[in-house]
Each structure stands twice: as C-alpha cells, then as structure tokens.
Amino acid sequence: RPSFSLVEDTTLEPEEPPTKYQISQPEVYVAAPGESLEVRCLLKDAAVISWTKDGVHLGPNNRTVLIGEYLQIKGATPRDSGLYACTASRTVDSETWYFMVNVTDAISSGDDEDDTDGAEDFVSENSNNKRAPYWTNTEKMEKRLHAVPAANTVKFRCPAGGNPMPTMRWLKNGKEFKQEHRIGGYKVRNQHWSLIMESVVPSDKGNYTCVVENEYGSINHTYHLDVVERSPHRPILQAGLPANASTVVGGDVEFVCKVYSDAQPHIQWIKHVEKNGSKYGPDGLPYLKVLKHSGINSSNAEVLALFNVTEADAGEYICKVSNYIGQANQSAWLTVLPKQQAPGREKEITASPDYLE
C-alpha cells in the first residue's frame, strides 16, 4: 500500500517527457586493471553495512574483502566496474550511499581537445634529411590498456614524424582493419595520427596496432581495448542535495536536486502538510503535497524555488525521483526565521522520512 496520503489529486505522470535533464554523476573511483581499490562507506553511525553492485548483493570472495565500513577489491578487472552502494542499517532507519567504480587505464588516447590543434603532431622535416619514422609524442601513447564503457567513443593516437612523411595504417588483432569490420566503421585522422571509433560495442574488444612507415623504416604500437558493458539503474541523486536552508519571512529560497539517470527521470518535490490540523490521515500515513513535478508544464524540475516565504513554509522538502527501474529520494529542511534574524546556511544533515529510502 502507498506510504502516504496525497492532499490533492495531482497528476503525477508527465504528459510528455521533458526534453533535457542535467545529470550529475555519483562519486567515481578509478583503478587500473590489476590494482587494489579500497573504498570507505561514507555513512555515519552504521550498525550494519551491506554492499551491492548494480543492485545485486555483494559478498566476500577471494578478491572482495568487506571489513567494517571498508570495501576492498584486490586485483581489479574491468568487470569490477559498475554502480556500487553501501547501505547503513540503523535501529530506526537506513541510508544508502552510491558510488561508481571504473577500472580503466584511460578512456581515450590523448585528449579530444588536441584535435583542434594537432600541429605539434605533424612534424615537417627538412627535405634533405631523410629519416625513418619515429614517435613525436610518446606521452600520448603510454596508456596501452583502455577499458571503455559501451557506447563511448574511443580514440587511439600514434603521433609520428619522418622524412618523407610516413603513412599510417591500422590493424585489429594483427590483421588489416577494414571499415566493414565494425558497424558504423571508423575514422582515421591522418593529420592527427588517430583512429576514432564511435559507440563502441563488445565486438570492438581487441588489440589495435598502428603501423607507421616510410621507405626508410617502419614502427608500430599496440593498444588493447576492453569494452565494459553497462546495466540500467534507478536514478541516483547527488549526495548533500537538496541542502538545508534558512531564510527570513518574506525571503526567497531555492532547493536543488541533481539527478543522474540513464532513463527518463520523473522528478517530484513533495512536502509534509497538515489537513484539518493533522499531519496524518486516518490510515496513519502522513499527508503529502506534490509541489512540483516534471512534465510539459514544468520548467527545470530539478530546482524548487519558493518566493515570499511564510512561517507555514518551514519544514521538510523531499526530492523524489523515479524512472522505470526504481526510485531515489533525498530531503532537506527549510527554517523560516523572524525578520529581525539574519539567515544563514545551516549545517547539512541527512533527514529522510521513514517511508523513504
């Protein structure tokens, strides 16, 4: 049964999905393959801590060690990448903290920004000085192992020089890499000595070798690409938001809820209210009012703005976000001060009603 009574019959489903949402990633922990990773559960006063990865119970094994509030992963592999959560169970409530683990050496070889000015990679030689190919920027080639989430773009670079100017070709797993070898093909930017593959899929896994050659010699360099598959997940809310706030009577205040969701998120701002002098209905459930929700008639749903506040506006405000997979919510308190008191930012506290996670 639902855990609240709505004060008014508000249509909760958006008539049409909003076109754009800002998304905020949870904290990301990065480790190189083979490294050990230790993460501390950032929750206080936990009687019992349980861990999950992509929504599935995480138990100790020969590589995963769970000690108190610490999670240790020994000899990390790309398969350890994913959405992790620790849940602190207390006597009266529970709280969950999310973080991402990305086991990777690098997302791409060199930065995309370099493509706007690749002059330093394209070395012009004096026509008299014949020279075999050589690498001009080995720093951009140090990362050999690339673990990349599926659907991302990958760029491998082999900046080189030589005289005459060498040519570059690419091999996949030691064989000529042809456009028809992958859906969507690939791009080669010769002036930047780069290979670009968009929207990578697991079949793109393998060794990619650039062969740079002229009549005086040939050099090569091999990258290994691993494509990490993803799983859909329920919304994630940025920790600490919305933040507690205080203002004077007649003042304005904003609550912000940063949402990370692969799928269309539906955002609701909810407040505990009183009806006929009571905070609870005859069924014992609290009365809640939906103040704002995402939909075609709603501007930026991640922000709840309150203007010309009164003392009646004081209380708890809940940002509740759902998608087809599940829900997440966080709340904050508004303190309304008499006019003579100056407002200040309050120390943030975690405040969740018992029926919300």
Partner: antibody, heavy 114, light 107 residues
C-alpha cells in the same frame, strides 16, 4: 542469482478475481520496481502496472485502473497482482518483471471460462 | 498513451542475413527504448535498453539505434537460434507500451 518465481496456473469464472504472486530473490527487492505485464494467447505484450516495494508507490495502465491492484510484501520479497471482475478476454499469461525488465518470472496462465 | 508502431509484423530471412526491424513512437521518447526477444512459451528476454545499450551477455550481432521517435533494431548476421518474436518497448512515460511484435522466421 536473480530469480522471480510466480504462482501456478489458475482457472477462474467470469466476474471473479485472481491474485498472482511473484517471489523475488538474488537482489535487493526494495531497490527495484516490480512490473506486471500480460500476454493474451497469440498476442503481444501489455504493461499492467508496477510497484516500488520500498514505499508501496504504484502506477497503473489506465486500462486496468480500478480492476488491477498491485501490492508488495517486503518481509517475504513477494509482489502480488490482483485482477478483479474477470472476463474471458483476461485469459492470458501474466508475467512479473524486475524494474529494469532484465529478469522476468516464468509466467502464470490465467484462464477465465464459465 | 505513447503508441509504438513496429514493422514489419513478420519477416523471413536466411542464416547470415542482416535483419532490420523498425519502431516508431507517436511522441518523442528520447532514447528510452528497449528491445526484447521472445521464444514460444518463454518470457521475453531483454536485448537492448536505452535504444543502443546491449544488455550484459547479449551477443554483439544484436544492436539498436535511434532517438526521439524513430528506432532501429539490427541483427548483423542471422543465426538459427535467433528465430523468435521481437518487441520494442518505450520506458519513458507510463503506461510503458510495447510494439505489436515482429515474428522472425528462417527461409
């Protein structure tokens, strides 16, 4: 491993009700919606509704509003879908699915016949 | 409700063929589309979510693309075990609606 195990086949009279159960294991039951989808013989898939077990929030296809009731019991990690005022066209296989639709129950055949 | 129009309703192809199924949404759904495979007497199996993400363990010959209202599902090289009915579904706005299905047969 993740599993959704549904109750067995049912034969019902028109006008009666049926309650199908879906017991979840292998994941945190309260962290995912549970969806109910039905499929009439030789037909396509139709979403009935869903519930978020942690707080009981439910959402329904208007075609079933008032006739379908979806509930969840956190203590047993079980979701239920009750369909009332049954008619012959409700004869179908009823599936439960985890929120991401990545895991489905085996299906429950409900036959409505006089 | 968002209507999902899937085509063709049935198709016959040979092993090794490239097979394409399309799905059109009556309203924009961003990339909130999933594709399922269903074999007779079995529950649907998730292949693609969020239009183009292959679900874990799904063979790489299955792919999806598209955004907004027009979506495509492709099997790059048809295998005998791919004989099934395929459904698209929008998971942007409730009620989450499915296409009417495409029955795939081997020539």
């Amino acid at each position: 491993q993740v599993q959704l195990v549904q109750s067995g086949a049912e034969v019902k009279k028109p006008g009666s009700s049926v309650k199908v159960s879906c017991k979840a294991s292998g994941y945190i039951f309260t962290s995912y919606n549970v969806h109910w989808v039905r499929q009439a013989p030789g037909q396509g898939l139709e979403w009935i509704g869903s519930i978020y077990p942690d707080n009981g929030d439910s959402s329904y296809n208007q075609n079933y509003k008032g006739r379908a009731t979806i509930t969840a019991d956190k203590s047993t990690s079980t979701a239920y879908m009750e369909l009332s005022s049954l008619r012959s066209e409700d004869t179908a296989v009823y599936y439960c699915a985890r929120g991401d639709f990545a895991y489905w129950g085996q299906g429950t055949l409900v036959t409505v016949s006089s | 409700d968002i209507q999902m129009t899937q085509s063709p309703s049935s198709l016959s192809a040979s092993v090794g063929d490239r097979v394409t199924i399309t799905c059109k949404a009556s309203n924009g759904v961003s990339n909130d589309i999933a594709w399922y495979q269903q074999k007779p007497g079995k529950a649907p199996k998730l292949l693609i979510y969020s239009a183009s993400y292959r679900y874990s363990g799904v063979p790489s010959r299955f792919s999806g693309s598209g955004s907004g209202t027009d979506f495509t599902f492709t099997i790059s090289s048809l295998q005998p075990e791919d004989i099934a009915t395929y459904y698209c579904q929008q998971h942007s706005t409730t009620p989450y609606t499915f296409g009417q299905g495409t029955k795939l047969e081997i020539k």
